[in-house]
């Protein structure tokens, strides 16, 4: 029950996180005009990953897309890439985790398979969350650097009579949405990984199992080959119950390590 709850909660938290990552990626307010010196401005600038906008105090808002690809800063391209990778991994993770949910029955899917899928989706959520956090952090770092550079320029270029006001940008709402969403996706992924451990049945190792058949008894070790009984190579453990041989497969395979970019 606790495992199902942990898995379900992990799924829901990741779902909210990924929705947040998508929202942050689409939002226009990644950077907003710094209003420290002028809290009430007649022209307010803000920028996203895909377009920049200007909101006038008249209420008129105009947004322009970044129609160039080569002319954009490499850092912005990197942030875009990180966010998209985060969304893609998250979406795949969600798809996998739906089938992995213990409360959903799909055919005769074994618990071991569900455990594998839960672990896979958990890892995907963790990487997705990390991508989002990394993307937002890179952008934030870029903003901080530019902010202090423009501040320095502001105070060095005041010699003339005519002032040219340089627009400084600070953290926009999208950054906070991205950080929180990335964190939630990460937490959801960890929860899925924890749930995976509970889903995976304990592997019981039997050194020798007695197989009772009418007439004669044969002792064999799992994985052994017995031509006379007509069995092929048996790589599975057999549990022996009173009164006859009932088999219950217990396979637990561990996924190989993959590098997610």
């Amino acid at each position: 029950m606790a495992v199902t709850a942990c898995q379900g909660l992990g799924f829901v938290v990741s779902l909210i996180g990924i929705a947040g990552i998508i929202a942050a990626t689409c939002m226009d307010q990644w950077s907003t005009q710094d209003l420290y010196n002028n809290p009430v401005t007649a022209v307010f600038n803000y920028q996203g990953l895909w377009r920049s906008c200007v909101r006038e105090s008249s209420g008129f808002t105009e947004c322009r897309g970044y129609f160039t690809l080569l002319g954009l800063p490499a850092m912005l391209q990197a942030v875009r890439a990180l966010m998209i990778v985060g969304i893609v991994l998250g979406a795949i993770g969600l798809l996998v985790s739906i089938f992995a949910l213990k409360c959903i029955r799909i055919g005769s899917m074994e618990d071991s398979a569900k455990a594998n899928m839960t672990l896979t989706s958990g890892i995907m959520f963790i990487v997705s969350g990390l991508c989002a956090i990394a993307g937002v952090s890179v952008f934030a770092n870029m903003l901080v650097t530019n902010f202090w550079m423009s501040t320095a320029n502001m105070y060095t270029g005041m010699g003339g009579m005519v002032q040219t006001v340089q627009t400084r940008y600070t953290f926009g709402a999208a950054l906070f949405v991205g950080w929180v969403a990335g964190g939630l996706t990460l937490i959801g992924g960890v929860m899925m990984c924890i749930a995976c451990r509970g889903l995976a049945p304990e592997e019981t190792n039997y050194k020798a199992v007695s197989y009772h058949a009418s007439g004669h008894s044969v002792a064999y070790k799992p994985g052994g080959f017995k031509a006379s009984t007509g069995f092929g190579s048996n790589t599975k453990n057999k549990k022996i119950y009173d009164g006859g041989a009932r088999t219950e497969d217990e396979v637990q395979s561990y996924p190989s390590k993959h590098d997610y970019v």
Partner: antibody, heavy 118, light 113 residues
Framework: EIQLQQSGAELVKPGASVKISCKAP????????MNWVKQSHGKSLEWIGN????????SYNQKFKGKATLTVDRSSSTAYMQLNSLTSEDSAVYYC???????????WGHGTLVTVSA | DIVMTQSPSSLTVTVGEKVTMTCKSS????????????LTWYQQKPGQSPKLLIY???TRESGVPERFTGRGSGTDFTLTISSVQAEDLAVYYC?????????FGSGTNLEIK
């Protein structure tokens, strides 16, 4: 075309207050911020302030803070400006004007002449 | 506050003549976000309310004749009337739309000979 209908001329005594109105029928009143502009006789224009027709939030020219109070009544699509503690310096034509792209004022009322005289 | 300085304060021209008036601002009116200059030109005929001619320094308001042209960027702006007509007799004001409080120039009075 948007017509901004302003109230008639006012003759008031020094120290008194006056409230002038600006009705904006025929268009979505709440889509625009309403601005008020002062023009003293034979002089230039001075921006007093503006009010968001939907939220009622205001921005004032520091010079007119305490002198002018801007309000709106959405139900009647009317903006109001109250001028307090009037002096002869406040004698002028007051215009209401809406706000559009470029923070420009495309439509103006015909103006309300306020004369402060004992 | 941004100070708007207009020149000349008055000018007299004949019908058909080309006329140019200037407006200087104490601060740049160019917004880096959209590369637009927040300067507006108005025409006020005697006994009338002001009328919007040009916004964003060079964008003509609908219904405004093509003879009116706005130019300039940053702090220096001009309004040109390519061929003055008798009905252009008015005072022309420039306005800062970039920062609060919005400020107007003292006006250029255009008179017809």
């Amino acid at each position: 075309e948007i017509q901004l209908q302003q109230s008639g001329a006012e003759l008031v005594k020094p120290g008194a207050s006056v409230k002038i109105s600006c009705k904006a029928p025929g268009y979505s009143f709440t889509d625009y911020n309403m601005n008020w502009v002062k023009q003293s006789h034979g002089k230039s224009l001075e921006w007093i302030g503006n009010i968001n027709s939907y939220y009622g939030s205001t921005s004032y020219n520091q010079k007119f803070k305490g002198k002018a109070t801007l309000t709106v009544d959405r139900s009647s699509s009317t903006a109001y400006m109250q001028l307090n503690s009037l002096t002869s310096e406040d004698s002028a034509v007051y215009y209401c004007t809406n706000f559009d792209r470029g923070n420009s004022f495309p439509y103006w009322g015909h103006g309300t002449l306020v004369t402060v005289s004992a | 506050d941004i100070v708007m300085t207009q020149s000349p304060s008055s000018l007299t021209v004949t019908v058909g003549e080309k006329v140019t008036m200037t407006c200087k601002s104490s601060q740049s009116l160019l917004n880096s976000g959209n590369q637009k200059n927040y300067l507006t030109w108005y025409q006020q005929k005697p006994g009338q309310s002001p009328k919007l001619l040009i916004y964003w320094a060079s964008t003509r308001e609908s219904g405004v004749p093509e003879r009116f042209t706005g130019r300039g960027s940053g702090t220096d702006f001009t309004l040109t009337i390519s061929s003055v007509q008798a009905e252009d007799l008015a005072v022309y004001y420039c306005q800062n739309g970039y920062s609060y409080p919005f400020t107007f120039g003292s006006g250029t009075n255009l008179e017809i000979k």
